[in-house]
């Protein structure tokens, strides 16, 4: 995993825009792990970053991700009166100028370098789940979540009519 110490230096100053150009409501620097306590790590390979899901060795430092929270109106057409309410959306940045992106065509999760304003592919609807977990749903593809597949992050379609191992899309956030 690459050194992540630069995150602390830019947590406040850098993150000052959202979907609509306003500031995030709050930010949170945290390590990201799966429901089964595997760590999400980021490595620089051939001038691009790769994302891994792996068991860390004892005392190995966890990579940190800056989560920037935004409030957003629910995009659903189910009601035009706002009764679906506001949601929380999030962007995830493990190092300066890089953000997690949903690649819906490849069903993959990638780290992209980009400038503000961030594209919609960098925004995820944050779901508050039980067991101190969260899930990340693609803003650009409702019903598709960040999940774990073959020791990598991938996009997983969640259909409420199907049985799905929910653990695949559950993540833990920790300050340590």
């Amino acid at each position: 995993a690459f050194g992540i110490s630069g995150v602390q230096k830019y947590t406040r100053a850098l993150h000052d825009s959202s979907i609509t150009g306003i500031s995030p409501i709050t930010e949170y620097l945290a390590s990201l792990s799966t429901y089964n306590d595997q760590s999400i790590t980021f490595a620089l390979e051939d001038e691009s970053y790769e994302i891994y899901v792996e068991d860390l060795k004892k005392d190995e430092k966890k990579d940190k991700v800056l989560l920037s929270y935004y409030e957003s109106q629910h995009p659903s057409n189910e009601s035009g009166d706002g009764v679906d309410g506001k949601m929380l959306m999030v962007t995830l940045s493990p190092t300066k100028d890089f953000w997690l992106h949903a690649n819906n065509k490849e069903h993959s999760v990638e780290l992209h370098k980009c400038e503000k304003p961030l594209p919609d592919q960098a925004f995820f609807v944050l779901h508050n789940m039980h067991s101190n977990c969260v899930s990340f749903e693609c803003k650009t593809d409702p019903g598709v979540f960040i999940g774990v597949k073959d020791n990598h992050l991938a996009l997983i379609k969640v259909d409420s009519s199907e049985n799905l191992c929910t653990e695949n899309i559950l993540f833990k956030l920790s300050e340590t």
């Epitope: 949601m87 969640v158 409420s160």
Partner: antibody, heavy 121, light 111 residues
Framework: EVQLVESGGGLVQPGGSLRLSCAAS????????MNWVRQAPGKGLEWMAE??????????HYAESVKGRFTISRDNSKNTVYLQMNSLRAEDTAVYYC????????????WGQGTLVTVSS | DIVMTQSPDSLAVSLGERATINCRAS??????????LNWYQQKPGQPPKLLIF???SQGSGVPDRFSGSGSGTDFTLTISSLQAEDVAVYYC?????????FGQGTKVEIK
Amino acid sequence: EVQLVESGGGLVQPGGSLRLSCAASGFTFSNYWMNWVRQAPGKGLEWMAEITLKFNDYSTHYAESVKGRFTISRDNSKNTVYLQMNSLRAEDTAVYYCARRNYGNWYINVWGQGTLVTVSS
Amino acid sequence: DIVMTQSPDSLAVSLGERATINCRASESVDKFGMSFLNWYQQKPGQPPKLLIFVASSQGSGVPDRFSGSGSGTDFTLTISSLQAEDVAVYYCQQSKDIPYTFGQGTKVEIK
């Protein structure tokens, strides 16, 4: 129009049972966590029970005061959530509200009008 | 269980004046870098209505005169300029841990 309509309330004797129903309309019911919240006459709000979605294995959670006596369930084909109440006590007398959590499960943002349950001999 | 305590129990404020309601949790309701604290308004004979979620974000369609602040264990709901239609009981609620618990309520009246 997004709507929750409760039914099944009424007068019941201590130790008796009652099943409350809540019919949902105007939204995709299967996408939302559902709750029951009650309010005793002249008192405050008390959260009772919650049921999640199919991909959460329809997990359920209860307030300690009703655990083992009340059961929440849902039928997505009927857009309905239920509260089965057994071994009812006088202190269960309240208006029972059916409530829907918002998309993402951060807060309750749709409420029914409530149905009154009176437990008395 | 997390115990939520509101103060005062009741409050009489003149029209156009500021109303402030406090809510204290028996332990921190912070998680994921946010405060899991919601505020609801309930008018007589009606179900509650969401005003504020995650301590300071306004619910949809909520007038700008309602604002929330705080983190950890101490929170405040402020009505910047009380209107006649704001007469109601106001509840804080924590949604960090099950069971989700409400404060006992604060009744706001016109002075």
